[in-house]
């Protein structure tokens, strides 16, 4: 067929960037180069129906189905999936191609199936069929690692019951705070299941396979550190193993450590101690408290006491099911064009969440930072001052959480005008949403000051373009007006913008950019 190819169908895979997914803190989206799905005309089908190559997606992978149409000008579209129609926002790239995208975040079985895209342009209509299936990894799992004591040895084993068999590594750091970030030179990684060196400051175990990377930190109370202002809190689900490490350093060996739960000493067999001399001949002792499978009655205050240090406690809370606690009320913000601003969500969650920030159907990396009060915070600053709806989405296997933000950028209107045989219409962005005036230009009013009182129809915020509200005003044209110049003006508290339109018979209309104040 000589009328090909006017459309191009591509698949964009968003790979979970391995190096950062390990920081269970983030869930970044790194796009690979688009893969051509070779949309071909479906033979013997009514109308113009294109069929893309079947897309196979891994569980939890994120993809974008994208169609490029070499048709400038007005195009409208609609996605249909399992008899539900989905919002569709076409835009144009710098080469004037219409671009229509469907983002599938974290693929699940329910998202597999046939996606139909209907595109209507001035010239023609297309139907594009995408078949999305889940790659046969449904049996794949990746579970957070947990600790076990090695039989007859002072060592910890890291276990992750995952399919395929994961690679397990210990991530060790002897510094404090920021310098223990994953790629820091202070961090040492050991790709083995058993760890004997249990005296380090920060100890984590990570497991990775085709589905990504999950890590668990060894919860530690350090009696030589100033206690946090709020009591550290450790959440566990019923049946999970509990491990708490108490660590203390003293000038000599003349001190001991003990664990108590709610002022009662822990039973024999639910703790073990290790000690060593450090390079400066001080004594380091660590005392582990552990429960192989926690029950509700293991909840409470665990206190580590020393004969030479002030005691410190942690609150262990056993829950039936994971949770995400945060306020989900939507938040609206209004900022200036160059004002620095970040969205922020404060939450408490167990198990740790994976999260994404989404704007205009595009997912952005989500970083989370632990706060001293047991809460975490995720901030998003990369909005590039684009107005619209921003979505924070978090999930952890047991719970899901979504919070909506609206960002409005204060700026004066910018008017776009168009006309048909029967009406002229102007549309404008800008915030606050503008009001409209229409003026007629004539011999009596060469400066276009004569008001047009009738036939004007205003629609405010009637559609979203790239997540941004647009206001429009339409002038219904009477025969008497044909051949006249009219001026539409949009104004808000930040300024006014106008366009002049020649009311004419249909055809190309000259639009003269006019006064902008």
């Amino acid at each position: 067929n000589q009328d090909l190819p006017v459309i191009k169908c591509v698949l964009i895979n968003h790979k979970n960037n391995d190096s950062s997914v390990g920081k269970s803190s983030s869930y970044p989206m790194v796009s690979e180069s688009p893969e051509d799905l070779g949309c071909a005309l479906r033979p013997q089908s009514a109308g113009t129906v294109y069929e893309a190559a079947t897309v196979e997606v891994d569980v939890s992978a994120s993809i974008t189905l994208q169609v490029l149409v070499d048709t400038p000008g007005n195009i409208s579209c609609l996605w249909v999936f399992k008899h539900s129609s989905l919002n569709c926002q076409p835009h144009f790239d710098v080469q004037n191609r219409g671009v229509v995208s469907m983002v599938i975040l974290k693929m699940t079985e329910t998202q597999a199936g046939e996606y139909l895209l209907f595109i209507q342009s001035e010239a023609t209509n297309y139907t594009i069929v995408f078949t999305v299936s889940i790659r046969n990894t449904l049996l794949f799992t990746l579970r957070r690692p947990y600790f076990r004591k090695m039989e007859n040895q002072d060592a910890l084993v890291c276990i992750s019951e995952s399919v395929p068999e994961p690679i397990v590594e210990w991530v060790l750091c002897d510094s404090q705070g920021e310098s223990c970030k994953e790629e820091s030179p202070a961090v040492v990684k050991k790709e083995e299941k058993v760890l004997h060196e249990l005296f380090g400051t920060d100890i984590r175990c990570c497991a990775r396979n085709e589905l990504g990377r999950e890590c668990t930190r060894l919860f530690t109370i350090d009696l030589n550190q100033t206690p946090q202002t709020t009591l550290p809190q450790l959440f566990l689900k019923v049946g999970e193993p509990l491990w708490i490490r108490c660590k203390a350093v003293h000038v000599n060996h003349g001190f001991g450590l003990t664990w108590e739960l709610e002022n009662k000493a822990l039973e024999e067999g639910s703790y073990f101690e290790m000690s060593t001399y450090s390079t400066n001949r001080t004594m380091i002792r660590i005392l582990f408290a552990f429960v192989s499978s926690v029950a509700r009655n293991d909840t409470g205050y665990y206190t580590c006491s020393s004969s030479k240090h002030p005691s410190q406690s942690a609150l262990v809370t056993i829950v039936e099911k994971g949770f995400i606690n945060a306020t989900n009320s939507s938040e609206d913000y209004e900022i200036d064009q160059y004002e620095e601003f970040c969205f922020s969500v404060r939450f408490k969650a167990y198990p740790q969440i994976r999260c994404t920030w989404t704007f205009s159907r595009k997912a952005f990396p989500c970083e989370q930072k632990a706060l001293d009060d047991g809460y975490s915070v995720s901030k998003f600053c990369n909005h590039k001052h684009q107005p619209g709806e921003y979505i924070f989405h978090a999930e952890n296997g047991d719970a899901q959480f979504t919070k909506m933000f609206t960002l409005n950028i204060r700026r004066k209107p910018q008017v776009l005008a168009e006309a048909s045989a029967s009406q002229a219409s102007c549309s404008s962005d800008g915030y606050p949403l503008p009001s409209w005036t229409w003026k007629k230009c004539s011999d009596k009013s060469p400066n276009c000051t004569e008001d047009i009182p009738e036939g004007v129809w205003n629609r405010k915020a009637n559609r979203k373009v790239f997540g941004q509200w647009v206001s429009s005003s339409t002038l219904n044209m009477s025969e008497a007006m044909k051949g006249f110049l009219v001026k539409c003006c949009a104004y808000n508290s930040l300024g006014t913008s106008c366009e002049t339109i020649l009311l004419n018979s249909p055809g190309p209309f000259p639009f003269i950019q006019d006064s902008i104040s």
Epitope: V6, D70, N96
Partner: antibody
Amino acid sequence: EVQLQESGAELVQPGASVRLSCKASGYTFTSYWINWVKQRPGQGLEWIGNIYPGSSIINYNENFKNRATLTVDTSSSTAYMQLSSLTSDDSAVYYCARRVVYLYFDYWGQGTTLTVSS
Amino acid sequence: QIVLTQSPAIMSASPGEKVTMTCSASSSVSYMHWYQQKSGTSPKRWIYDTSKLASGVPARFSGSGSGTSYSLTISSMEAEDAATYYCQQWTSKSPTFGGGTKLEIK
């Protein structure tokens, strides 16, 4: 079969204007961008601009913006390029070419040789 | 505007020899397309989307690359391959072509 038939060779005086034509056949003329490309003797290719016959949207290379004018006549499936204020630097072969959504030119005209000389 | 630099400008190869020519972009581009032009004729689409052969192009041709570095390779030179090859990008608003590599037969 897709064909782009260009007008014949032109010899014009410096300072004058010329209109080259490109007649399309074998496909839906209004569904594809028509592009114009310049090739000076023994030189590479330079994009001048393009026009979408379905809605007369036009893009120009900045270097040609003030001297090239692209138009179409959809009734005869013909694209035109007018070049004004001609100088000897405009002596070249001018091609029309059809663009596809993959952003390459799949069919080219045979070229029109323009000679600007007094 | 993205500038494409082709090298070498002129090269010659014996029949059966492997030939590689390169196209370097001044900034990253998504795809590269290649055209073949023989003296006195219009350019012909040859390779599109970096590595896909246009219909009728012999399988001895291949294209590869990403970012700013792309290449066209002929696995075994034949006399009919003698021509000028141009690379072209359209990642930016305006398309640009390379200066061409003229391939001659020894």
